[in-house]
């Protein structure tokens, strides 16, 4: 049985050109992380693999940075990076546990931050 | 196509070390990961542990971890594992395995798709 | 370390016939199972993964069933070039191989 929750930072906003952390946790549940995706859309931006570490897909390599923790930076941002981000917890045994970001890159320099949480 | 050719049969003296090689063609080497397999006479498959060929980070089985030491190197697409202070239980058939999914492709990885041909490493006195 | 059970140990069928191959985990994997055929001398060959999903080139004959802790490959019409040893691997959570099942010619 699925016992856990993913909470995530929601929705976010971001500077043109800045960067942003985006960042999920996954909690109530013992289960082990085997493998954490990003994806955007339908795009893989990164993986962690428990065993074999941080793996940034080609195609993102000059803009994405791994963490903290199995958190994402997405540096130089574009009003193209504007939509929906997944991160995607491979679990043992429980399963896969998704959560969902939504980050709009603003023109304007008074770009707001939604609610973040602190992880442990 | 795509393949793995391993190196040739080794024999090999309790005490000693091998390395064995595993030569990759046919797609872009670092965008998977490289398992090695054992499989001693008669016996069943035993994984001995794995490389990304990307960045390089290994995750060896626990019963061999401190004598076993996988590398890669993608100037030539090969993979390497080295096995030392070898004893005679070490006499196997040792494969090379590549994963079946990309890193890119976002799957759960750990079912191997393309197999060297084996190297046969045997440890006698 | 998750153990995979196999059974039976060796199966003895006619061509033809059905074979029915067992595989257990002592934990649940989910989908995250292969199955492999070995012929001797030979390295394994890829016929089954994510549980159910046959790998390129792999006859329609062969299918794979289950999800968690129980699972089944299934050969509906044995042909020669089937007799073997089949393995399944679990990798939910690092690598496992199961024992092994021999397909012999009864």
């Known amino acids: 049985m699925m016992t856990g929750t993913i909470e995530t930072t929601g929705n976010i906003s971001a500077e043109k050109g800045g960067s942003i952390i985006l960042q999920c946790h996954l909690s109530s549940t013992t289960a082990q992380v085997t493998q954490v995706n990003w994806e955007q859309q339908d795009q893989l931006l990164a993986i962690c693999n428990a065993d074999l570490g941080w793996h940034i897909s080609p195609s993102f390599k000059d803009r994405v940075a791994p963490g903290p923790g199995l958190g994402l930076t997405l540096q130089s941002l574009t009003v193209n990076d504007t939509g929906e981000y997944f991160c995607i917890y491979h679990t043992y045994p429980d399963g896969t546990y998704t959560g969902r970001i939504f980050l709009e890159v603003l023109e304007s320099s008074v770009a707001e931050h939604g609610a973040r949480f602190q992880i442990p | 196509q795509v393949q793995l050719v391993q190196s040739g049969a080794e024999v090999k003296k309790p005490g000693a070390s091998v390395k064995v090689s595993c030569k990759a063609s046919g797609y872009t080497f670092t965008s998977y990961a490289i398992s090695w397999v054992r499989q001693a006479p008669g016996q069943g498959l035993e994984w001995m542990g794995w490389?990304?060929?990307?960045?390089?980070?290994?995750n060896y089985a626990q019963k061999l971890q401190g004598r076993v030491t996988m590398t890669t190197d993608t100037s030539t697409s090969t993979a390497y594992m080295e096995l030392r202070s070898l004893r005679s239980d070490d006499t196997a058939v040792y494969y090379c395995?590549?994963?079946?999914?990309?890193?890119?492709?976002?799957?759960?990885?750990?079912?191997?798709?393309?197999w060297g041909q084996g190297t046969m490493v045997t440890v006698s006195s | 370390e998750i153990v995979m059970t196999q059974s039976p140990a060796t199966l003895s069928v006619s061509p033809g016939e059905r074979a029915t191959l067992s595989c257990r985990a002592s934990q649940s994997v989910s989908s995250n199972l292969a199955w492999y055929q070995q012929k001797p001398g030979q390295a394994p060959r890829l016929l089954i993964y994510?549980?159910?999903t046959r790998a390129t080139g792999i006859p329609a004959r062969f299918s794979g069933s289950g999800s968690g802790t129980e699972f089944t490959l299934t050969i509906s019409s044995l042909q020669s070039e089937d007799f073997a040893v089949y393995y399944c691997q679990q990798h939910a959570n690092h690598i496992t191989f199961g024992g092994g099942t021999k397909v012999e010619i009864k």
């Open positions: 994510g549980a159910s």
């Open positions: 395995a590549r994963d079946l999914s990309s890193f890119w492709s976002g799957d759960v990885l750990g079912a191997f798709d393309i």
């Open positions: 490389i990304s060929a990307y960045n390089g980070n290994t």
